[in-house]
């Protein structure tokens, strides 16, 4: 039994008074010629001539989907009864942006739900939103083709000082979150260990507060907080970080035992397990994947394995007893 099969049942369409069996008899050579499919569409049951009462199904090319009623009906006068049907793109095309902006990830097409991040060269920030998501066949929020990079006020203010500081005469002092952060700066997702909560904060405010010795604030990732693997890893990383022997400042972030600061992006990048050096007395007893055997790993290995989203259960700190 097929739902698409036509056994000649006398169906009545929603907006038709006449049953198919009531249609006038037609001569064999009459009927309808092949209809013209909508743009980016094609006819599934393609042939030269269709009988009166026969339906054709409109399908769309890969990357497009039908919107509207996708069946055409052959009428006695040789024309087609067709509702409004079109093939709408289900993917977004890589946006055209000014050359100074970098799109990550760089692809030709993006599926619905996929996001892109726009970034600028060092010392510059995107003059507007930096994260865009493919919804339907367009980007949300819409990407303006006049979108460009502007000088990062943070960089201007800091002079020769570190991030979160500003030049005051010949010395560096912490920026004031209230007074020095009224300008636009990119959004960061931040975790506060005191409140055990994460929130979106402008970069300037986060850096100023961190400079003022707010040690409870931890950088999670660039961009506003959004549920997903990046946030999940950011939180897990924060928990692991308390045992890290290495704490290396890197852009907005701090890199730990299992990470390396990328010189070109000023971001902490997870090492891969084989890149871990054996040294260090921060050991953990773990169970890998579905294995029942226990294994002693150092903090670097634990960090890289969790960063790679591989299944691992931490049984307890220290060496496995067996």
């Amino acid at each position: 039994f097929s739902i698409m099969e036509n056994n000649g049942q006398p169906c009545i369409n929603d907006d038709e008074e006449m049953k198919e069996v009531d249609l006038p008899e037609i001569e064999a050579d009459s009927g309808c010629p092949q209809p013209v499919p909508p743009e980016n569409g094609f006819i599934r049951n393609e042939k030269q001539l269709y009988l009166v009462g026969e339906d054709v199904e409109i399908s769309c090319l890969t990357g497009f989907e039908t919107v509207g009623y996708q069946y055409f009906r052959c009428l006695p006068d040789g024309t087609w009864r067709q509702g409004d049907v079109e093939c709408q793109r289900t993917e977004c095309i890589k946006p055209v942006v000014q050359e100074v902006l970098t799109i990550t990830p760089f692809q030709r097409l993006y599926r619905i739900g996929e996001s892109i991040e726009l970034t600028c060269p060092k010392g510059f920030v995107v003059a507007g939103p930096s994260r865009y998501t493919c919804q339907g066949n367009s980007w949300t929020p819409p990407i303006s083709n006049s979108l460009t990079c502007e000088k990062d006020t943070l960089t201007k203010l800091k002079g020769h000082c570190q991030l979160g500081q500003k030049q005051s005469g010949s010395e560096c002092i912490c920026m004031s979150p209230e007074e020095d952060c009224s300008h636009h700066s990119e959004d960061l997702c931040v975790f506060d260990t005191d409140s055990n909560d994460y929130f979106t904060s402008p970069a300037c405010k986060f850096l100023a507060e961190k400079c003022l010795n707010n040690q409870q604030l931890h950088f999670l990732h660039i961009g506003s907080c959004q549920d997903g693997r990046q946030l999940e890893w950011g939180l897990e990383r924060t928990r692991l970080s308390s045992n890290s022997t290495k704490k290396e400042s890197c852009g907005y972030d701090t890199c730990y035992d299992w990470e390396k600061c990328s010189a070109s992006t000023s971001k902490c990048v997870c090492l891969l397990p084989p890149q871990c050096f054996k040294g260090g007395n921060q050991l953990y007893c773990v169970k890998m994947g579905s294995s029942t055997s226990e294994k002693t790993l150092n903090i670097c290995e634990v960090g890289t394995i969790r960063c790679a989203n591989r299944k691992m259960e931490i049984l307890h700190p220290g060496k496995c007893l067996a």
């Epitope: 990830p105 990046q230 890893w233 070109s264 992006t265 084989p274 890149q275 050096f277 989203n309």
Partner: antibody, heavy 118, light 112 residues
């Protein structure tokens, strides 16, 4: 200076066996994972196997699983690759490699040629 | 396995000329926490491969800064700004974002 020196390879018949070794110097051998990478005439560069610090964990590419065994002797600062049931497609120059925080294959030996042919 | 396609397969250049090599991946190398494990190696005639670029755009230790890497997702580029005689050889891209680690087939840079 990091140095990795592979033993001589050689000509082996299909189905035969060969054990490669790699002697390391210039760094604390037991503190690093180690790997074998090969370069065949047709397949180009291919990662073969990786071993952790003490040999308790080993990883292989699918095509060599069950035929090749990576092992190490930290006291001798030596990495091994036991190759059994050799096939013509295993013909390649085999390199011993050590990672760094920059890359998985940061340091390479000079390589040793293994030819599998009748 | 992830396939890395390098173009061109051979590149003829004159000393001082700037050249680019492309490496295209069969799937995105950007993982779900935002890291991309893409590397570039140079294998000079009769020598072992030598690391040039790691993590897409970071320069390997002791590598001259005429070498630069860029790209994201599936498209990556190695640029040499002013080729020197010692740069001749075969260039390989390699990915470690997905197991097993795979290499491109190589681009042979030769003198015109």
């Amino acid at each position: 200076e990091v140095q990795l020196v592979e033993s001589d390879g050689g000509l082996v018949q299909p189905g035969g066996s060969l054990k490669l070794s790699c002697v390391a110097s210039g760094f604390s051998f037991s503190d690093y994972y180690m790997a074998w990478v090969r370069q065949g005439p047709t397949k180009g560069l291919e990662w073969v196997a990786t071993i952790n610090y003490d040999g308790s964990s080993t990883y292989y590419r699918e095509s060599v699983k069950g035929r090749f065994t990576i092992s190490r002797d930290n006291a001798k600062r030596t990495l091994y690759l036991q190759m059994d049931s050799l096939r013509s497609e295993d013909t390649a120059t085999y390199y011993c490699s050590r990672p760094s925080t920059e890359a998985l294959f940061a340091y390479w030996g000079h390589g040793t040629l293994v030819t599998v042919s009748s | 396995d992830v396939v890395l396609t390098q173009t061109p397969s051979t590149l003829s250049a004159t000393i001082g000329q700037s050249v680019s090599i492309s490496c295209r991946s069969s799937q995105s190398l950007l993982n779900d926490v935002g890291n991309t494990y893409l590397y570039w190696y140079l294998q000079r005639p009769g020598q072992s491969p030598q690391l040039l670029i790691y993590l897409v755009s970071d320069l390997g230790s002791g590598v001259p800064n005429r070498f630069s890497g860029s790209g994201s997702g599936t498209d990556f580029t190695l640029k040499i700004s002013g080729v020197e005689a010692e740069d001749l050889g075969i260039y390989y891209c390699m990915q470690a974002s997905h197991a097993p680690y795979t290499f491109g087939a190589g681009t042979n840079l030769e003198l015109k």
